[in-house]
């Protein structure tokens, strides 16, 4: 279930899967919500002089039990992802950090009157993902009033400094406020040429589509089908950007299919699941656990409740079912993607539905019945 | 459809055949479960026959060649139009059936959940539009529903695609640049249905389109969110109480 | 009642030019695309060109092309047809209709539902 | 252009008769384009059919309108004395629109 509970001055102690610089707890836990293997985190506030370098430290953890040990730290603040917490699962962070440096890559420095205009400017630029304001009362006369654009491999800051008269914070174009606009075509027997930055397998342009929304880096993707002639990248999603945030023109290429990410998208964003259920498909990963159960849908339900999961496989082989049902296996990979997806499977894929905002039952909100 | 594929049985339970008995029975329409009593068409499909009585209601089929004369079928008791539809124009393409006899649901015959209000500003990323309506522009009923999935596209692009209409915010495009997928004749009053936070909405009912499956000529859809206060309205003002609003 | 009153007609000398309005009533203007049909005296019916509701698309016949700008205000209900280079083949009587558009087996329809009176257009010198 | 050929060009008939008027297209035209109108002298058309086979409203249902691809039919079951008049078929399928050149029925 959900857990949003904060335990002050406590770390939890193993299971690390990643570390990274966030301003706040808060930051962080929304980092771990979207981290496809992360469940708990502990995130440093204060620490003693000798360790500066893992001040704001964001350490995010796995379980196999749900839980760590937990250790004193004064300075330290740990929690669970929002994994499962429905409506409170939002990549949108507004806050503002006075006095502190986010830094990453400056790629631009213009002049702006205040913060508001600074976040404006980076909500509208396809590469920045945060940005450092330096006050008029900053020390360095050069940088006073100036906007620092900044982006990074990981999409947060390279290390956090505390620093006067300096304002950061983040992009807004996963608050749908970006003004660059969001075109939402989608271009058959396409591919993009530009510049790869990750790679993931998926079922389907859709699900491309929507992992390089939530990716820091990807501004638009390329998805080859299973029909694709080159076996090794058969329902591969290439997750693409470039120098000036625009593809270069497409390339006609047979059972290819390009897009961009919605990530600049003023309306609502698609959500960050996949609800789909794919038939006679069967995706490939660590076995988690295996329960029987009647249905598709039901076993959809099931590896959304259990944490861990990522996706699962409902299986209709006449081996595979018993009188409860038939075998629903749950399984999980290193990046919340498939491992490899096959066809002609007796049975269907999909996804955990973890990271929906609305995890609950399938009945609908409005209900038209006779008395 | 056009470049679409067969669809299972119980896939799409909310999807009906609305058919008219004249001389012979023909489908003519699509349309949406929306509660016991209730289905949820185009208003168009209703242009020139405006009679209750000659209409047949199926659901609950894969094949229209499963329907024979004993095939149980649905009579209206009631027709909705919208008040502001007009023949002379595109605009208010929708139409309430209330049912003589309340639907028992199975497996293979249930409602579709109705988007709120709010939803008017969601985007959708897993749609489909399903029917027994032409494969091609000159081409014919199909015998097995068809289904295709197919993206949204934004109303003002819409809008440029179809500078002699108005694209208004109470309708809502699909198709894909380069066409080849979309509804066509046949297929008017049926679903368009987008799977959202774990459940399938209606987002659209089948209205319009320029050709069937022609480039940069997306299809045309009534979108169901901006009706939602006339369709209440109409539930709950008949004699049946249809109507229950939960949180979500 | 829709009603559609065409005026601005009148004897022109050739190579002279002319607007016609028709006044629109008793629908909303600004949901239909409208076009201008003439018939010479004696002949039959030719559409000379159409715009959109919104007024961003217009199209002509070739007979009018370069010569002819349909348009409307949709603020006061009226739509116009500017004519210039005027030539004795111009001479007609000029109807505007309002073109309906509606629905029919998931395509739209067209037809011109509703005609004004028409007003004469002459071009002699 | 699509050039819409009507045929045949006069049909002289008394009241009561059957009038079977024929519009032939050099296209293919979707028949939701394709509508039928009667003209009197002095007067302006008026919408019959659309669509092909929909009647317009008041119009009577001795009007009936058939056909679709290239051959379409107007017919009118028994004529009446006011039903005397021109009648164009006319294509808004492609543009250029376009009108027949009417076919004239006259009293016999």
């Known amino acids: 279930g959900c857990m949003t509970q904060l335990y002050k001055n406590t770390f939890f102690r193993g299971g690390d899967l990643a570390a990274i610089y966030t301003p706040d707890a808060q930051y962080c836990q929304k980092m771990c919500t979207f981290h496809p293997r992360c469940l708990l985190f502990s995130f440093l506030a204060v620490t003693p002089p000798k360790e500066t370098n893992k001040r704001f430290g964001c350490f995010m953890k796995e379980s196999i039990t749900g839980t760590l040990p937990r250790i004193h730290r004064t300075g330290a603040i740990s929690g669970h992802s929002l994994k499962q917490c429905g409506h409170q699962i939002s990549a949108c962070h507004r806050d503002i950090y006075k006095g502190l440096d986010m830094r990453g890559s400056n790629f631009n420095i213009s002049k702006t009157d205040n913060i508001e205009e600074c976040q404006k400017l980076c909500t509208n630029n396809f590469h920045c993902q945060f940005f450092t304001y330096a006050t008029s009362a900053f020390y360095r006369p050069e940088y006073r009033k100036k906007c620092l654009l900044k982006h990074s491999a990981s999409g947060t800051p390279t290390s956090i400094k505390s620093a006067d008269n300096l304002v950061s914070g983040f992009s807004l174009k996963s608050c749908a406020l970006s003004e660059i606009g969001c075109p939402m075509d989608i271009f058959q027997h396409s591919a993009f040429a530009d510049l790869n930055v990750s790679q993931v397998i998926t079922p389907d342009a859709f699900v491309c589509r929507t992992i390089c929304t939530f990716h820091p880096n990807c501004l638009f993707f390329t998805f080859y089908t299973n029909e694709w002639e080159t076996e090794s990248q058969r329902n591969v999603c290439f997750l693409k950007t470039s120098k000036s945030g625009r593809p270069s023109p497409p390339i006609p290429q047979e059972n290819a299919i390009s897009g961009y990410s919605l990530l600049t998208c003023r309306k609502t964003r698609p959500e960050p699941c996949h609800s789909k259920i794919y038939s006679g498909v069967d995706f490939e990963g660590e076995e988690l656990n295996v329960t029987f159960v009647q249905g598709a849908d039901v076993c959809q339900e099931t590896c959304t409740k259990t944490i861990r999961c990522q996706f699962f496989i409902y299986s209709l082989l006449p081996q595979d079912c018993k009188e409860e049902g038939c075998k629903c296996s749950l399984r999980l990979s290193t990046d919340g993607s498939p491992t490899r997806i096959t066809y002609g499977m007796q049975g269907s894929s999909g996804y955990s539905l973890r990271l929906c905002k609305l995890v609950d039952s399938p009945d609908c909100t409005t209900k038209i019945n006779a008395r | 459809i056009v470049g679409g594929t067969n669809a299972s049985l119980g896939e799409w339970p909310w999807q009906v055949s609305l058919q008219v008995k004249l001389v012979s029975q023909t489908h003519l329409c699509g349309g949406s479960i929306i509660g016991r009593q209730w289905v949820l068409t185009a208003a168009h499909c209703f242009d020139g026959i405006p009679y209750p009585d000659v209409w047949r209601i199926y659901g609950g089929i894969l094949s229209l060649s499963e329907i024979t004369k004993e095939t149980p079928s649905s009579r209206i008791k009631e027709l909705i139009i919208h008040q502001e539809y007009k023949v002379s124009e595109g605009n208010y393409d929708i139409a309430l059936i209330k049912l003589q006899t309340p639907l028992n649901y199975t497996e293979f015959q249930k409602p579709i959940c109705l988007p709120s209000k709010a939803d008017t500003n969601t985007i959708y990323t897993n749609c489909w539009v399903t029917g027994w309506g032409y494969t091609k522009e000159q081409g014919e009923t199909q015998n097995i529903l068809q289904k295709a999935t197919i993206p949204l596209v934004p109303n003002e692009e819409c809008q440029k695609k179809y500078r002699d209409y108005v694209i208004n915010k109470q309708m809502i495009c699909a198709g894909y640049k380069e066409g080849g997928t979309d509804a066509c004749k046949g297929d008017s009053g049926g679903p368009l249905v987008c799977k959202h936070s774990g459940r399938w909405q209606l987002v659209g009912i089948t209205s319009w389109g320029e050709g069937c499956g022609r480039k940069d000529q997306p299809g045309v859809y009534t979108k169901v969110s901006e009706y939602m206060d006339w369709i209440l309205e109409k539930t709950q003002s008949s004699d049946v109480r249809a109507l229950e609003t939960s949180s979500a | 009642e829709v009603q559609l009153l065409e005026s601005g007609g009148g004897l022109v000398q050739p190579g002279g030019s002319l607007r016609l309005s028709c006044a629109a009533s008793g629908f909303t203007f600004s949901h239909y695309l409208m076009t201008w049909v003439r018939q010479a005296p004696g002949k039959g019916l030719e559409w000379v060109s159409y715009?959109?509701?919104?007024?961003?698309?217009?199209i002509y016949a070739d007979s009018v092309k370069g010569r002819f700008t349909i348009s409307r205000d949709n603020s006061k209900n009226t739509l116009y047809l500017q004519m210039n280079s005027l030539r004795a083949e111009d001479t007609a009587v000029y109807y505007c209709?309002?073109?309906?558009?509606?629905?029919?087996?998931?395509?739209?329809?067209?037809?011109?539902?509703?005609w004004g009176q028409g007003t004469l257009v002459t071009v002699s010198s | 252009e699509i050039v819409l050929t009507q045929s045949p060009g006069t049909l002289s008939l008394s009241p009561g008769e059957r009038a079977t008027l024929s519009c032939r297209t050099s296209?293919?035209?979707?028949?939701?384009?394709l509508a039928w109108y009667q003209q009197k002298p002095g007067q302006a058309p008026r919408l019959l059919i659309y669509?092909?086979?929909s009647r317009a409203t008041g119009i009577p249902d001795r009007f009936s309108g058939s056909g679709s691809g290239t051959d379409f039919t107007l017919t009118i079951s028994r004529l009446e004395p006011e039903d005397f008049a021109v009648y164009y078929c006319?294509?808004?399928?492609?543009?250029?629109?376009?009108f027949g050149q009417g076919t004239k029925v006259e009293i016999k």
């Open positions: 715009i959109s509701p919104s007024g961003g698309h217009t």
């Open positions: 669509g092909a086979s």
């Open positions: 209709a309002r073109v309906a558009r509606g629905i029919a087996a998931r395509s739209r329809t067209s037809y011109f539902d509703y």
């Open positions: 006319q294509q808004s399928s492609r543009t250029p629109w376009t």
């Open positions: 296209q293919f035209v979707n028949s939701n384009y």
